[in-house]
Amino acid sequence: LPVNTRCKLEVSNFQQPYIVNRTFMLAKEASLADNNTDVRLIGEKLFRGVSAKDQCYLMKQVLNFTLEDVLLPQSDRFQPYMQEVVPFLTKLSNQLSSCHISGDDQNIQKNVRRLKETVKKLGESGEIKAIGELDLLFMSLRNACV
């Protein structure tokens, strides 16, 4: 069975109303530019076959992908929210740097790979969609990692 190490975020990360609000405002701005409402990145398929105790590790993978492959390429857009939210999410990513899983993470990798492929296939609109789901990313990190 998979064993988790240090897959934990302090609840205080999610108790700062200002940055919570900015994260959600960024998601809203991007979702207004997202026309593809049928596709969901952070949804039922992402969590399928992944037990709750392993979902923090799953969300760590999604967070790192979002930071490196989505937010950095789009960093000039959606200001002033982007310049405030990226450092906050980077801080969460750093706090999860020692979150590992030993054991079978096949389902996790498959689900994350599907999410990445969907974003890449959609091109820039996939990146916009991922930013529009930052509210889901944020809430899923809180739900899984606290």
């Epitope: 999610f14 969901r40 039922e44 992944v50 037990s51 509210d135 889901l136």
Partner: antibody, heavy 121, light 111 residues
């Protein structure tokens, strides 16, 4: 088959306390966020409280914050709601509800039949 | 007082379509992807019919569909049937980590 069975309701005087329980079966309990939702007679639904899979986050409606405490015992497949300083306006049918899928405690896909709480002098 | 605003009632004839709106402040429906819809027949337990704005749980008729635009979410029931007569509630998760419900809409099937 998912089953949620609430118990612990009853008649209590204003200022009194009750502890509601929800016994879960038919699924891996500690994979899901759980919630309490209430419905006053003839009224709409009101979310009361929610807890994530491991009890790390516990959230409350403003109307019950400081009076109600949600908890869970994953070893016993059970969810609880400790209700203190009860008021007449807390009179309602209290439902236990489970997230529709494991990563989504906010979509309430499975509900119990409810337990009735009556606060009356 | 419900934070999300729904019409108290809507009606339609069998075979018609009806749409129920659910309007919130930007801090509720408008900002997020967390909208759900529930059906509740009198004396019965609520039933999830739409989650994640527009997804249908298995076993729910494809006559039910959800959408969202700005601060308003909508539930559309197409090809209305007698058994659709019920109360419908929208809900949204918020940045305050609470779930808000609309006040409910009674759907009446005419005739």
């Amino acid at each position: 088959e998912v089953q949620l069975v609430e118990s612990g309701g009853g008649v209590v005087r204003p200022g009194g306390s009750l502890r509601l329980s929800c016994a879960a079966s038919g699924f891996t309990f500690d994979d899901y966020g759980m919630n309490w939702v209430r419905q006053a007679p003839g009224k709409g639904l009101e979310w009361v409280s929610g807890v994530n899979w491991n009890g790390g986050t516990r959230d409350y409606a403003a109307s019950v914050k400081g009076r109600f405490t949600i908890s869970r015992d994953n070893a016993k497949n059970s969810l609880y709601l400790q209700m203190n300083s009860l008021r007449a306006e807390d009179t309602a049918l209290y439902y236990c509800a489970r997230g529709w899928y494991s990563g989504s405690p906010w979509s309430l896909g499975h509900w119990g039949r409810g337990t009735l709480v009556t606060v009356s002098s | 007082q419900a934070v999300l605003t729904q019409p108290s009632s809507v009606s339609g004839s069998p075979g018609q379509s009806v749409t129920i709106s659910c309007t919130g402040a930007s801090g509720d429906v408008g900002a997020y992807n967390f909208v759900s819809w529930y059906q509740q027949h009198p004396g019965k337990t609520p039933k999830l019919i739409i989650y994640d704005v527009n997804k249908r749980p298995s076993g729910v008729s494809n006559r039910f569909s959800g959408s969202k635009s700005g601060n308003t979410a909508s539930l559309t029931i197409s090809r209305l049937q007698a058994e659709d007569e019920s109360d419908y509630y929208c809900s949204s998760y918020t940045s305050r980590y609470t779930t808000e419900f609309g006040g409910g809409t009674k759907v009446t099937v005419l005739g």
